[in-house]
């Protein structure tokens, strides 16, 4: 079940053992180890994005944190699909994509996330407080759904940070920052806690409740513990929803999927693919209350949820066992 | 010891609103995905709302999207269901319960609070 | 979303006899199935996991078994404690419940 790291409190080296650095390498496996250890849940992030080229051109990338295998992704604006929102695109990971106007071209970017590019004018046209959804249908964990929509004064060429706008706090830091650091960290710590054999390791103590033997996992976001209510959807200008797209029924029936090409389907299969997954140029992912990143210019190191370095197809949970984690 | 305390059931008139709380203590409550459950008077247990445990990702049965809506405060431990347009099919006994990933199932639920739709 | 039919709805059986209670799933869920017990005004109780997996604290003569769409929950030498309903859980997908297994004393 759940494994969590007891974390002894910090305390300077004894001198003689550790050299000068004695006391960056006593810290440093502490906060890595409560990183690797730290259990989250299935997860979708949303991030929306207006070009700085075209002002009425929108990027929306969404993307799934689980183990479980997709079978369909919907996007929709205006609120979750069937609960007012429209589908602008539904995206299917064997019959291919199916895209409405003013969707320009929706495709996937890696094995669990797409990406969508909207345009218009007028009446079809997003506006800046419109809110966009991705749900994401996985086995097993169940269908699974997010909303973003882009900061109110948003300069074009930024971002709104991934996931929902109200919930950034440590999802932003988790999901953005930490997921990159951890693969590399996760390694080092056992580097570290290799050549530190003589020094006893932290144990970890599985919770009390559990009805299943602890498992830790190294790939996982941090989720902190946050103060943060979520809003499923937001109320948008209904000036900005288009007014003449029809709504889309994917389950009407396996028949409108026979008229797409075989390659629509296609997929990135490889490392390889997943490597040259296109990343917004002047994005800045803006943290509000652990301030990681700065503000203006400057990227948090972009290795999830756009790049994904697990070479397994399935993701980053095919490491762990039949079960997943929580 | 692993407690969920549910509180603001009542009755309500058709198309009111009513929001439900669950308080949690004795675990992390940051890191589980919490749902709430409901037993209708016939005894069918039905998923109401599903949300993860950073509240960034939700799920509704078809039945409920739109109407309701939940949401947790993760520094007060509580698990919220705002339940709006209420129909007399959503009287229920309306249960908190702890989303456990490693063995896909609810391991640990509240003792319930009752829900009454009715003129 | 897929269908869980429980039989028999009720069923009544002494003390010290042996109980099976089926599960049947709509499509195949796999082994990802759960048990859970509720007892006369009480909340449900998780009872057993993975189909076949006794939860913590669940007494050994409870004994799930099935995988695909058809699954059992066996009690063997029922005790005075174990009437109460039983409710069978799939999770291949959002989770959806039986309509339930009422057992009573007979």
């Known amino acids: 079940m759940r494994t969590e790291a007891q974390v002894p409190a910090l305390q300077p080296p004894e001198p003689g053992l550790e050299g000068a650095m004695g006391h960056r390498t006593l810290v440093l496996p502490w906060v890595l180890l409560t990183l690797c250890v730290t259990a989250g849940t299935p997860e979708v992030w949303v991030q929306v994005r207006m070009e700085a080229t075209e002002l009425s051109s929108f990027t929306i990338r969404c993307g799934f944190l689980g183990s479980g295998s997709i079978s369909l992704v919907t996007v929709s604006w205006g609120g979750p699909n069937g609960a007012g929102g429209t589908t602008l695109a539904v995206l299917h990971p064997e019959r291919g994509i199916r895209q409405w106007a003013p969707a320009r071209q929706a495709r996937w970017e890696t094995q669990s996330s797409i990406s969508l590019i909207l345009e218009g004018s007028g009446a079809s046209s997003p506006c800046a407080n419109t809110t966009f959804c991705c749900k994401f249908a996985s086995f097993p964990e169940g269908s699974w759904e997010a909303c973003g929509s882009l900061p109110p004064s948003s300069d074009p060429g930024l971002s709104a940070p991934p996931t929902p706008a109200p919930i950034l706090r440590a999802d932003l830091a988790g999901i953005l920052g930490v997921s990159g650091v951890l693969l590399f960290g996760c390694v080092y710590l056992l580097h570290l806690l290799r050549r530190h054999k003589h020094r006893p390791a932290p144990r970890l103590q599985p919770s009390r409740t559990s009805p299943q033997a602890p498992r830790a996992r190294a790939w996982a976001p941090s989720q902190a513990s946050q103060a943060a209510l979520h809003v499923p959807y937001a109320t948008i200008n209904t000036s900005c929803r288009p007014a003449t797209l029809d709504t889309a029924h994917p389950h009407g029936g396996p028949s409108w999927w026979a008229s797409l090409p075989t390659h629509a389907a296609h997929r990135p299969q490889g490392p390889a693919a997943w490597a040259s997954t296109p990343i917004p140029a002047r994005g800045s992912f803006v943290s509000v209350e652990n301030g990681l990143y700065a503000q203006a210019g400057e990227r948090p190191p972009h290795t999830g949820p756009g790049l994904t370095l697990f070479p397994d197809p399935r993701g980053p949970r095919a490491m762990e066992g039949p079960l997943g984690v929580r | 010891e692993v407690k969920l305390v549910e509180s603001g059931g009542g009755l309500v008139q058709p198309g009111g609103s009513l929001k439900l709380s669950c308080a949690a203590s004795?675990?992390?409550?940051?890191?589980?995905?919490m749902s709430w459950v409901r037993q209708t008077p016939e005894k069918r247990l039905e998923l109401v709302a599903e949300?993860?445990?950073?509240?960034?990702?939700?799920h509704y049965p078809d039945n409920v999207k739109g109407r309701f809506t939940i949401s947790r405060d993760n520094a007060k431990n509580t698990l919220y269901l705002q339940m709006s347009s209420l129909k007399s099919e959503d009287t229920a006994m309306y249960y908190c319960?702890?989303?456990?990933?490693?063995?896909?199932?609810?391991?640990?639920w509240g003792q319930g609070t009752s829900v009454t739709v009715s003129s | 979303d897929i269908q869980m039919s429980q039989s028999p709805a009720s069923l009544s059986a002494s003390v010290g006899e042996t109980v099976t209670i089926t599960c049947r799933a709509s499509?195949?869920?796999?082994?990802?199935l759960a048990w859970y017990q509720q007892k006369q005004g009480r909340s449900p109780q998780f009872l057993v996991y993975?189909?076949?997996t006794l939860a913590e604290g669940v007494p050994s003569r409870f004994s799930g078994g099935g995988s695909g769409t058809q699954f059992s929950l066996k009690i063997n030498s029922l005790q005075p404690e174990d009437f109460g309903s039983y409710y069978c859980q799939h999770h291949y997908g959002n989770p959806t419940f039986g309509g339930g297994t009422k057992l009573e004393i007979k």
């Open positions: 949300l993860s445990n950073s509240g960034g990702s939700f």
């Open positions: 004795g675990f992390t409550f940051s890191s589980y995905t």
């Open positions: 499509e195949n869920v796999n082994s990802y």
């Open positions: 319960a702890r989303h456990n990933w490693d063995v896909y199932a609810m391991d640990y």
């Open positions: 993975n189909a076949q």
